[in-house]
């Protein structure tokens, strides 16, 4: 049954706006993963590649960011854009490739030997307890390499993946983004025709775990296209 | 450290509308999801509404929705609640929050709705 | 909705004792979606667990919290004069956001 596969990521209570509450984006959203309200094109193939409408860097790839594609151009009209490589120029971290987040205006490397999240001038109490704190990279202080920041634990807000414990991804939950458990076998996931093409999705699931990927549950091959039931399946 | 500060509350008559602003400082403003939550006076805390980092993203409580718009300006690391079509029972103290789980909270700023 | 019950609405202890604080969900939340606040007269409220049981930064070791499904538990092991206070739980599983009525701390 549905039931049975749904897991911490899936939605158990419908979202707005069956949900009780009302969501309005800059354009589709969708009322569970996998399903999307007209209008959208979350489901664009890579063999019809065209610019993929965003609203927020979280519905592009892990390479993308969502911004308008000409300097000064119509807010309203962004698309997914190619990361920005180390010394070039950026304006958030978003806009930076992974293994570099924004620093005075230029995308500079991160340290790896510490916690990928922001830090706040408070050190020593941020290192001193579980909370962990996302802000403020212009603030970052180089701390002694014994100084490991706490990942974050579920249900905890998250920036990037890399900012959760092992076992976690970052996902979108409503208007935050917070740690989640990456799916196990037999949970249904949400399959992404094109790489990063998340959508509009209220919140997201996590990926499928390491030997897994998602797949038409076997059953659900005679269903229509669009109601098809993902799950995590072994290769 | 992270601050936020609200202001804009006010005595309103009935019908009449408001807006309030929460200045943040102290973190990366675009970053974070941010929250409006209100507290009526000796009653308990409830959600109003809440807006993605890019503000993108708004939700509402059926309570307050079409009257209510949450907005941010990035620019500016400042919050929005334009309130319209007030009602007694919106008296409150109305407080911005960060997050989706509240963890810094401004001070609250006092809206009263009154003929 | 998701309606929070908590109980007691009411506890009065002594400082140095223990406070067991019981919030119960109206439906599964499945995940550990749910914050606990303390606040104190004419002060906003402060968080002090995220996640069920991750105490936010600042927050003494004496709190802690636990629980899954549909039974969650604030405890504060041993009770300081600045702990008593009216205290709120919260779940961010879905939409509408909900909070318990509160229990106040008092002093017996």
């Known amino acids: 049954t549905l039931n049975s596969v749904l897991n911490s990521n899936a939605i158990k209570n419908l979202p707005p706006p069956l949900g009780g509450a009302a969501g309005h984006p800059g354009s589709a959203v969708s009322a569970a993963p996998g399903i999307l309200y007209p209008g959208g094109n979350k489901y664009q193939t890579i063999d019809n590649y065209q610019p993929y409408p965003c609203a927020e860097d979280e519905e592009c790839g892990t390479d993308e960011y969502c911004a308008s594609p000409t300097r000064g151009g119509d807010a309203g009209v962004q698309i997914c854009l190619a990361c920005r490589k180390r010394r070039k120029r950026c304006m958030r971290h978003a806009m930076c490739c992974p293994g570099n987040y924004c620093k005075n205006g230029i995308c500079v490397s991160s340290d790896q030997n510490h916690f990928r999240g922001e830090i706040e001038e408070t050190i020593t109490e941020s290192f001193g307890n579980d909370h962990s704190t996302l802000d403020g990279y212009s603030r970052r202080t180089t701390l002694s390499s014994k100084m490991y920041h706490t990942k974050g634990q579920e249900g905890s807000v998250c920036l990037r993946s890399s900012d959760c414990a092992s076992g976690l991804c970052c996902a979108r939950h409503f208007w935050s983004k917070i740690c989640k458990p990456v799916l196990k076998e037999g949970q249904v996931c949400t399959k992404h025709r094109r790489k990063g093409s998340h959508g509009l999705e209220i919140f997201q699931r996590c990926y499928c775990g390491e030997g897994l990927s998602c797949r038409i549950q076997k059953d659900h091959h005679q269903a229509s296209n669009s109601s098809r039931l993902h799950t995590c399946q072994r290769h | 450290q992270v601050q936020l500060v609200e202001s804009g509350g006010g005595l309103v008559q009935p019908g009449g509308s408001l807006r309030l602003s929460c200045a943040a400082s102290?973190?990366?403003?675009?970053?974070?999801?941010m929250t409006w939550v209100r507290q009526a006076p000796g009653k308990g805390l409830e959600w109003v509404s809440g807006i993605s980092g890019s503000g993108s993203y708004t939700y509402y409580a059926d309570s307050v929705k079409g009257r209510f718009t949450i907005s941010r300006d990035n620019s500016k690391n400042t919050l929005y609640l334009q309130m319209n079509s007030l009602r007694a029972e919106d008296t409150a103290v109305y407080y911005c929050?960060?997050?989706?789980?509240?963890?810094?909270w401004g001070q609250g700023t006092l809206v009263t709705v009154s003929s | 909705d998701i309606v929070l019950t908590q109980s007691p609405a009411t506890l009065s202890l002594s400082p140095g004792e223990r406070a067991t604080l019981s919030c119960r969900a109206s439906q599964n939340l499945f995940s550990p979606y749910l914050a606990w606040y303390q606040q104190k007269p004419g002060q906003a409220p402060r968080l002090l667990i995220y996640?069920?049981?991750n105490r936010a930064t600042g927050v003494p070791a004496r709190f802690s919290g636990s629980g899954s499904g549909t039974d969650f538990t604030l405890t504060i092991s041993s009770l300081e004069p600045e702990d008593f206070a009216v205290y709120y739980c919260q779940q961010y599983m879905t939409l509408p956001l909900t909070f318990g009525q509160g229990t106040k701390v008092e002093i017996n």
């Open positions: 929050a960060r997050t989706i789980y509240m963890d810094y």
């Open positions: 102290g973190f990366t403003f675009n970053n974070y999801g």
């Open positions: 996640g069920a049981s």
